[in-house]
């Protein structure tokens, strides 16, 4: 039975700034025909038929749900893209993470401007801080890493704060072993 395809993002962020670029790729098993991909944005069929969908100079209207489909195989699980206009944007490698998987957070400045004295907060408490911009990289996420995150920083000498982002770490499903 062919597997469901999966949509991946490059760069891997599903929250981006207006004007930025992102490529969505429809990955699946043994899909050789490059022109047989269907893309759906908020339920509407896109004109794009390649396995990659390029979003160039993102607009607010590009926000929403994306799904892909190869041939008559099931549609992929949805991926949600959100386009922002702000000074700071907290980006995460994933908003729902399986326990034991990596989690990466980035405090992204508008137009890639330098951000100084970046502080990450989790559930209202300062979590990580440094003189310049920096990231949080958790190798093995645990349920305790679930929470509401945001970042603050200085851009052109002024203090700014990102919108909050909810991160959920879910327990990995237990393998079932059957006695023969």
């Amino acid at each position: 039975v062919p597997q469901k395809p999966k949509v991946s993002l490059n760069p891997p962020w599903n929250r981006i700034f207006k004007g930025e670029n992102v490529t969505l790729t429809c990955n699946g098993n043994n899909f050789f025909e490059v022109s047989s991909t269907k893309w759906f944005h908020n339920g509407s069929l896109s004109e794009e038929t390649n396995s990659s969908l390029n979003i160039v100079n993102a607009k607010f209207e590009d926000s929403g749900e994306y799904k892909c489909q190869h041939q008559q195989v099931n549609e992929s699980e949805p991926v949600y893209l959100e386009v922002f206009s702000d000074w700071l944007l907290l980006q995460a490698s994933a908003e729902v993470v399986m326990e034991g998987q990596p989690l990466f957070l980035r405090c992204h400045g508008w137009r890639n401007w330098d951000v100084y004295k970046v502080i990450y907060y989790k559930d209202g408490e300062a979590l990580k801080y440094w003189y310049e911009n920096h990231n949080i990289s958790i190798t093995n996420a645990t349920v305790e890493d679930s929470g509401t995150y945001y970042c603050t920083g200085k851009v052109w000498q002024l203090d700014y704060e990102s919108e909050p982002l909810n991160i959920t770490v879910i327990k990995a499903p237990r393998e079932k072993y059957w006695l023969q």
Epitope: Y116, K117, I119, A126, L127, K128, Y129, W130, Y131, E132, H134, N135, I136, S137, I138, T139
Partner: antibody
Framework: EVQLVQSGAEVKKPGESLKISCEGS????????IAWVRQKPGKGLEWMGI????????KYGPSFGGQVTISADKSINTAYLEWSSLKASDTAMYYC??????????????WGLGTLVTVSS | QSALTQPRSVSGSPGQSVTISCTGS?????????VSWYRQYPGEAPQLIIY???GRPSGVPDRFSGSKSGNTASLTISGLQPEDEADYYC??????????FGTGTKVTVL
């Protein structure tokens, strides 16, 4: 009360390995950077590097990358400074210090009492 | 990254003022307002006395003040007292994840 307790003085021969420690107490260890600072006899302070125990983010001073290894074990609230092959020039007092976020400022607010390392044949 | 430059020693009589300079570059002192000052008594660990150029931690007397102009930071001790005799170090964030200390200044109370 915040405390940084460092391991005791060490006397080693050139070529030997060594790992010294700095145990933090009285605060949430994983959420504060720990730096290591060298002071050679009669000389000034040199920033060696720093680690954030929460995610093991580690940064080294330009003269120290590849010469030492900084690590931390957040389960026992301890940071480490390690040499694989000591040299006589490593003889110094080594301080650990906490880099904290205090009212929006990033400062070294607490220091250990230092570990004296003597390397001599 | 070189150490920040401080005078080797300064001295003054009790009650006088002394100023210690700390000269760096646009890449450290001149580029960031993350300049700190530490006092170190012989055989002891350093103690923070000034942060963010001019901030004073609680418990540090207001005789200690910090300032910055261009690539040079300064520490002024007014109303010098015998217990101020110690080594003083400036420090600054220097970009690219590097932190740098000054060469150190010995303050002598005559």
């Amino acid at each position: 009360e915040v405390q940084l307790v460092q391991s005791g003085a060490e006397v080693k021969k050139p070529g030997e390995s060594l790992k010294i420690s700095c145990e933090g107490s009285g605060y949430r260890f994983s959420s504060y950077w720990i730096a290591w600072v060298r002071q050679k006899p009669g000389k000034g302070l040199e920033w060696m590097g720093i680690i954030y125990p929460y995610d093991s983010d580690t940064k080294y001073g330009p003269s120290f990358g590849g010469q030492v290894t900084i690590s931390a074990d957040k389960s026992i609230n301890t940071a480490y400074l390690e040499w694989s092959s000591l040299k006589a020039s490593d003889t110094a007092m080594y301080y650990c210090a906490r880099l904290a976020l205090i009212r929006g400022s990033i400062i070294f607010d607490y220091w250990g009492l230092g570990t004296l390392v003597t390397v001599s044949s | 990254q070189s150490a920040l430059t401080q005078p080797r020693s300064v001295s003054g009589s009790p009650g006088q003022s002394v100023t210690i300079s700390c000269t760096g570059s646009r890449g450290d002192v001149g580029g960031y307002d993350f300049v700190s000052w530490y006092r170190q008594y012989p055989g002891e660990a350093p103690q923070l006395i000034i942060y963010d150029v001019s901030g004073r931690p609680s418990g540090v007397p207001d005789r200690f003040s910090g300032s910055k102009s261009g690539n040079t930071a300064s520490l002024t001790i007014s109303g010098l007292q015998p217990e101020d005799e110690a080594d003083y170090y400036c420090s600054s964030y220097a970009g690219s994840e590097i932190y740098v200390f000054g060469t150190g200044t010995k303050v002598t109370v005559l």
